[in-house]
Interface confidence: medium
């Protein structure tokens, strides 16, 4: 399929002008390459009529132009003074020859329609209202007034002043006079449908003294606006149907042969194919609304229509707006996982791509909610506090210059299942949708922290260990302290790295973190995790409580914040605290010797405290063993 896109059918009348917009993929080569407009001949040859290289054919001389708009990735062909000879098949395209990338366009130029003398032409869109003006002389002021529609030689009455209304115009046509006017009456026809188009005659009086006016009504199908979007990007349909339908239910539907299937409406209907990737936003109180669809797929291409009706469904005779969406498969947006799987108690690391040209843009992550119109409250962002209920288990890691950021969510529960969006406040095309599926865990987590009930005592030394399996042997291990603006990596000791690389003893793979001496501000959530370069992997979280040791008082933990992930009964918590003291007694003295060596090597004493927030992987690896 060619990535060039334009209007398939263009129609106009003699003497008028047309403007044809063709879209091309946004690449530097395309922006600079030759653009052309050619006419398809019967022999298969396409004769150039105008090109961006400056060529202009004789038959287009003085009446056509081709303008490139590189900032929009479009070029526009303007043709004036149309004649019926311009009817035919054309191509708009890119390339040094006319066999390059192109889109077929059919142009039809028809004759100016001939009407009886003094015919007033009314042009209205489907669903709108027309007011036909009918003038008469004073002599017919008290005579019967009527409007009829020409069908061949006959003229069938639509409405008259005796209150007759043709059934097909019932509740749509009214005949009235304004104020004190004695020489004019009006007929309103609302909810116009295509079959209303035609020649109407309005009449006051009967016989030869009757006053007659001719009116030609043209009912226009909405001209679809062309939308050119990349695969995996997003599209916004901006719908403005007017104040008259401000209070009616709104919908967006997709045309399917004769029908238009509703994708979303304000009454809560939503097509399952768009679950998790669609939002309907009212724009104001005048009936304007927009529909945003993310994660565009090839099959999303097609004709769309928005409308309003109390049923929330397409209804003939109600105003609509139309679009034709083209999905360019030569996308600049990288292919990322659309489904991420996790298990209860575990974690997920979700990679969110963004436009690399906008590395300074603000990054966000939101949870799509299936209320009637869809909404997506932000859970975390580069300048947004982590939302309630996600403290200690959600963080966003920006990797400037890489064109991606990572969101980590741990302590997973089945309630976390659902759809999430990666957003930036910059290029809105780069909105990606991820479905998170959380299943019940069937085995122990890969990362385990001991002690599980962590209470540190102010002024003392406190060490916490993270056990990891051999499969993480070659990966970088880290500890970080979680805060509302991320998880800052700390210095830690990887004891597993001391082992021979030939064998891996599952029981001795430990990365530990020491708080020395413990301070009140050390209290909070800590994460143990693994990563390879900029690629984050599994994490686990633990809440470290900090208390003052009062002389002679037993060491009892406060309510265990870690129970959220572990659900440990109180008796176990007590036992853990005893084991924790035992662990302290049996700490490997080499750890402390290693710490002293590092300090003597010139590191600041403060940096050796875990809460010193080294703030980067470098800080951690500096004191890993």
């Amino acid at each position: 399929q060619s990535p060039i896109f334009g209007p398939q059918d263009v129609s106009s009348i003699e003497g008028n002008s047309v403007s044809i917009t063709c879209y091309y993929p946004d690449t530097s080569v395309n922006r600079h390459t030759r653009k052309y407009w050619c006419r398809q001949g019967a022999n298969g040859y396409c004769a150039t009529l105008i090109s961006s290289n400056g060529y202009l054919s004789k038959e287009y001389s003085g009446r056509a132009s081709l303008i490139n708009f590189p900032e929009n990735s479009t070029f526009v062909i303007n043709i004036a003074h149309l004649t019926q000879e311009d009817t035919g098949s054309y191509k708009c395209g890119l390339g040094t020859t006319n066999r390059g990338l192109f889109f077929d366009v059919s142009l039809e130029v028809s004759q100016v329609p001939e009407f009886p003398n003094d015919t007033h032409v009314y042009t209205k869109d489907i669903g709108r209202t027309v007011t036909i003006e009918c003038r008469f002389k004073e002599g017919n002021a008290h005579s019967k007034k009527s409007l009829c529609k020409k069908r061949g030689e006959a003229c069938e009455v639509v409405i008259d002043s005796t209150e007759y209304v043709d059934p097909s115009y019932k509740d749509r046509a009214i005949l009235f006079m304004k104020g004190t006017s004695r020489d004019i009456f009006y007929v309103n026809i609302s909810h116009l449908i295509p079959s209303d188009a035609g020649l109407y005659v309005c009449q006051a009086g009967e016989g030869p003294s009757a006053d007659k006016n001719n009116a030609d009504l043209q009912v226009l199908e909405p001209e679809p606006e062309l939308l050119y979007k990349d695969l995996r990007s997003s599209v916004t349909f901006e719908c403005d149907l007017g104040r008259e339908v401000a209070n009616d239910a709104k919908y967006l539907c997709r045309k399917n042969k004769e029908t238009c299937d509703v994708i979303i409406n304000t009454l809560g209907k939503r097509d399952p194919a768009f679950e998790g990737r669609i939002l309907l936003t009212p724009r104001d109180d005048n009936g304007r609304f927009s529909v945003l669809i993310t994660g565009l797929r090839k099959e999303d291409a097609g004709h769309y229509q928005c409308g309003a009706h109390s049923s929330g469904l397409p209804q003939e005779g109600w105003p609509v707006q139309a679009w034709q969406l083209f999905v360019n498969e030569e996308s600049t947006i990288p292919n990322s996982r659309s489904v991420v799987k996790g298990v209860t108690g575990g974690s997920v690391a979700i990679v969110c791509p963004y436009n690399p040209k906008e590395s300074s843009s603000l990054k966000y992550w939101c949870h799509w909610e299936a209320d009637e119109n869809g909404r997506c409250p932000v859970l975390v962002g580069t300048q947004a506090l982590v939302q309630e209920g996600y403290e200690g288990r959600l963080a966003l890691f920006d990797q400037p210059g890489s064109g991606a950021y990572t969101v980590i969510l741990n302590q997973l529960t089945t309630q976390d299942s659902g759809f999430y969006w990666c957003l930036t406040d910059g290029d809105s095309r780069w909105r990606t949708t991820i479905e998170l599926q959380v299943a019940e865990a069937t085995k122990k987590p890969d990362l385990e922290v001991t002690p599980q009930n962590a209470t540190a005592v102010i002024g003392e030394t406190f060490t916490i260990s993270c056990h990891y399996p051999c499969k993480f042997y070659s990966q970088e291990k880290y500890w970080c302290k979680w805060s509302n603006d991320g998880c800052h990596i700390l210095p830690s000791h990887d004891e597993g790295a001391r082992q021979s690389s030939v064998s891996c003893d599952q029981s001795s793979q430990i990365v530990s973190m020491t708080l020395n001496p413990v301070k009140k501000e050390d209290e909070g959530w800590y994460w143990c995790g693994v990563k390879e370069g900029q690629v984050y992997g599994e994490t686990t979280a633990i809440y470290v409580a900090v208390e003052e040791r009062t002389r002679g008082s037993p060491h009892i933990n406060p309510t265990d914040a870690n129970a959220r992930a572990k659900d440990a009964p109180e008796e176990e918590a007590m036992e853990s605290s005893v084991r924790e003291d035992e662990n302290k007694a049996n700490l490997d003295p080499r750890l402390f010797a290693d710490e002293r060596e590092i300090q003597n090597a010139g590191d600041q004493a403060q940096e050796n405290r875990a809460s010193g927030n080294a703030g980067s992987a470098g800080g951690q690896s500096g004191s890993s063993k």
């Epitope: 916004t236 939002l279 309907l280 936003t281 009212p282 724009r283 104001d284 304007r288 927009s290 945003l292 966000y364 939101c366 909404r375 997506c376 409250p377 932000v378 947004a384 969006w421 957003l423 406040d425 909105r431």
Partner: nanobody
Framework: QVQLVESGGGLVQPGGRLRLSCAAS????????MAWYRQAPGKQREWVAI???????HYADSVKGRFTISRDNAKNTVYLQMNTLEPEDTAAYYC???????????????WGQGTQVTVSS
């Protein structure tokens, strides 16, 4: 959820100048276009100037060359510098912004309460 607050209006003589400011606040995720509109007594509200997110600016013919719109994205603020004011510029000036909030990333129009500009000798 989103508030727009205008300031800087007042009474000025023909040929004088004023600078209007409008600050957006609330749970803002992103702002697309910021614009100034005005409404004179008995007339329709009309747009005066638009500052698009990408940096481009647009002006109504009646103010071209006299008014300058600018915006500070970091402060979510838009300004309108009005020079060589004429009596025809007398109107209530309204700030408009297309804002996506932290709850709803789709864009929606928000309006300020308006600030009165009177040009009279």
């Amino acid at each position: 959820q989103v508030q727009l607050v205008e300031s800087g209006g007042g009474l000025v003589q023909p040929g004088g100048r004023l600078r209007l400011s409008c600050a957006a606040s609330g749970s803002i995720f992103s702002i697309r276009d910021m614009a100034w509109y005005r409404q004179a007594p008995g007339k329709q509200r009309e747009w005066v100037a638009i500052a698009a997110r990408g940096g481009s600016t647009h002006y109504a013919d009646s103010v071209k060359g006299r008014f300058t719109i600018s915006r500070d994205n970091a402060k979510n603020t838009v300004y309108l510098q009005m020079n060589t004011l004429e009596p025809e510029d007398t109107a209530a000036y309204y700030c408009n912004a297309e804002v996506a909030t932290m709850i709803q990333p789709g864009f929606r129009d928000y309006w300020g309460q308006g600030t009165q500009v009177t040009v009279s000798s």
